[in-house]
Interface confidence: low
């Protein structure tokens, strides 16, 4: 298969040989008659680079074509080529290079005695010759021309169209839509890649992450995703992951554990304000934070224990002498003395 960027198309539409004569005014010998001079007509086409003065001689630098016999004297040609499968109308000249925008065209109408002999060069067979040069931009529109000489008319049209997947003024821009690992795009009017929704980059291979996905800490494999890099979390990968076990702390960067006010230690799990949060001291004792989750209680008179939870019994052991009975008072005691004894602890005898 010929690789090409575009194709020059020539559509032969109508040929009129008013008198059925050759270019040298002779009758077409061996013609199809009647009339006696009917010309079996075929065409030779030569497409070449632009020449200010067109030379009909080879080489046909852009290509050449010879048609079968298409009609006798005057005839119209349908699109597609009609009954003869060997001829397709328009005639196509594939290009494997950038279309230059100019060309020269030679179309010769010739007569043949035998439909099997179209190759033999014989100037006496020439009915008419058209030689022209044109500027032509790429496009779908057909340009139409009518070439008239004294006895013949040739109506034809031509255009240059890009092959599928080729774009631009010279059909030199290649763009084939795709939707795979190598690109997710369609093609614009000038062959530019138009990324499918959710994709970006020169080849539309970079997925557009979920809007808001942190550019530094998030990424995605397909559109709308937001996958987090190590140490980050959250829908937009904008939340750092704290040090494992971090309890009352925050982070600005991964694996940090910056303690909130009132907390300390590696995991921010040690209460620096134990007194306020837990009120451990009982019975009106005074609590003092001593750091790292510890504290001390200063007991009021009459109380003891780590949290001043124990009341001191002043009667244990009893200080009362001589069988006196003891009554516990706050931070004190009193002795009830038996008859004959008195004093703070019944230590004195009345005798």
């Amino acid at each position: 298969q010929v690789w090409s960027s575009g194709v020059f198309e020539l559509k032969l539409q109508e040929f009129v040989n008013k008198k059925g004569l050759l270019g040298n005014r002779n009758c077409c010998r061996g013609g199809a008659g009647p009339p006696p001079c009917a010309c079996r007509t075929f065409f030779r086409v030569c497409l070449k680079h632009y020449q200010a003065s067109v030379s009909p001689e080879p080489p046909c630098t852009y290509g050449s074509a010879v048609t079968p016999v298409l009609g006798v004297d005057s005839f119209s040609l349908p699109d597609g080529g009609g009954a003869d499968s060997a001829f397709s109308n328009p005639i196509r000249f594939p290009f494997g290079f950038t279309w230059p925008g100019t060309f020269s065209l030679i179309i010769e109408a010739l007569h043949t005695d035998s439909p099997d002999d179209l190759a033999t060069e014989n100037p006496e067979r020439l009915i008419s010759r058209l030689a022209t040069q044109r500027h032509l931009t790429v496009g779908e529109e057909w340009s139409q021309d009518l070439h008239s000489s004294g006895r013949t008319d040739l109506k034809y049209s031509y255009r240059f169209v890009c092959d599928e997947h080729y774009y631009g003024e010279g059909c030199s821009v290649f763009c084939r839509p795709r939707d795979d690992a190598f690109g997710h795009f369609t093609c614009g009017e000038r062959g530019e890649k138009v990324c499918n929704p959710g994709w970006k980059g020169p080849y539309c291979t970079e997925p557009i992450c979920l809007p808001g996905c942190d550019e530094q800490h998030g990424f995605c494999d397909k559109p709308g995703e937001c996958k987090c890099r190590v140490g980050w979390q959250g829908r937009y990968c904008d939340e750092c992951i704290r040090y494992p076990g971090c309890l009352h702390g925050t982070c600005q960067q991964p694996w940090q554990c910056n303690c909130q006010e009132g907390w300390g230690g590696l995991f921010c799990n040690q209460d620096l304000n134990y007194c306020t949060h837990h009120k451990p001291c009982k019975n009106g004792a005074t609590c003092t934070n001593t750091g790292q989750g510890s504290y001390t209680c200063s007991c009021r008179p009459g109380y003891t224990g780590a949290t001043c939870e124990l009341g001191i019994d002043e009667c244990d052991p009893s200080p009362c002498k001589n069988g006196g009975s003891c009554t516990d008072l706050e931070n004190s005691y009193s002795c009830t003395c038996p008859p004959g004894f008195y004093g703070k602890i019944c230590e004195l005898s009345a005798m």
Epitope: P197, L210, P211, G212, P223, G224, R235, Y236, D238
Partner: antibody
Framework: EVQLVESGGGLVQPGGSLRLSCAAS????????IHWVRQAPGKGLEWVGG????????DYANSVKGRFTISADTSKNTAYLQMNSLRAEDTAVYYC????????????????WGQGTLVTVSS | DIQMTQSPSSLSASVGDRVTITCRAS??????VAWYQQKPGKAPKLLIY???FLYSGVPSRFSGSGSGTDFTLTISSLQPEDFATYYC?????????FGQGTKVEIK
């Protein structure tokens, strides 16, 4: 921890005004849109409007356009819904919710919502 | 405004059932659709965004599909905590609009 807390709801007479607040914490306030969504008793969800705190750009539902105004104070990380000319049909629980920029882009949804505040319009 | 029409409006199902809720947009909304779950007296919770992406922390029994105008929320095996009302929401064109809701009840 991301949090949105609405306040300011209550009972108001038809034609009256009320201002709801939505206090945001735990995220960069200017990196998201804040939307107000309401739900009338026993009914479905209805979008009221939204704001991009970064540039103050707002959009409203046709049903509240001209009566409600959304604003944001980035220094306080708070969005507001000023409701004027209130009608009985405005009675609803009002939620604020956060959403990434350009709600029209990819259908990314409203991922955090406040607890809601009840507005009752009645005489 | 774009209308989002959910069906059915309510359904009864048993634990372990496969449940499918559909949402039809009145015009093409690409894949700009989110699904929410709401329980009585609570705020909605995001389940699915961009039509088919499972939101962080949502159980994998929930899935979403569709693009253009037709969208589906599927619960592969209904759990007791899944009995709630579900809403779809488009955010392709302003204003964002919600479906009317589908209530999933215990059979």
């Amino acid at each position: 921890e991301v949090q949105l807390v609405e306040s300011g709801g209550g009972l108001v007479q038809p034609g009256g005004s009320l201002r709801l607040s939505c206090a945001a914490s735990g995220f960069t306030f200017t990196s998201y849109d804040i939307h107000w969504v309401r739900q009338a008793p026993g009914k479905g969800l209805e979008w009221v409007g939204g704001i991009s705190p970064a540039d103050g750009d707002t959009d409203y539902a046709n049903s509240v356009k001209g009566r409600f105004t959304i604003s944001a104070d980035t220094s306080k990380n708070t969005a507001y819904l000023q409701m004027n000319s209130l009608r009985a049909e405005d009675t609803a629980v009002y939620y604020c919710a956060r959403n990434d920029y350009d709600v029209r882009f990819v259908g990314s949804g409203m991922d955090y919502w406040g607890q809601g505040t009840l507005v009752t319009v009645s005489s | 405004d774009i209308q989002m029409t959910q069906s059915p409006s309510s359904l009864s199902a048993s634990v372990g059932d496969r449940v499918t809720i559909t949402c039809r947009a009145s015009q093409d909304v690409s894949t700009a659709v989110a699904w929410y779950q709401q329980k009585p007296g609570k705020a909605p919770k995001l389940l699915i965004y961009s039509a088919s992406f499972l939101y962080s922390g949502v159980p994998s029994r929930f899935s979403g599909s569709g693009s253009g105008t037709d969208f589906t929320l599927t619960i592969s095996s209904l759990q007791p905590e899944d009995f709630a009302t579900y809403y779809c929401q488009q955010s392709f064109t302003a204003p964002p609009t919600f479906g009317q809701g589908t209530k999933v009840e215990i059979k």
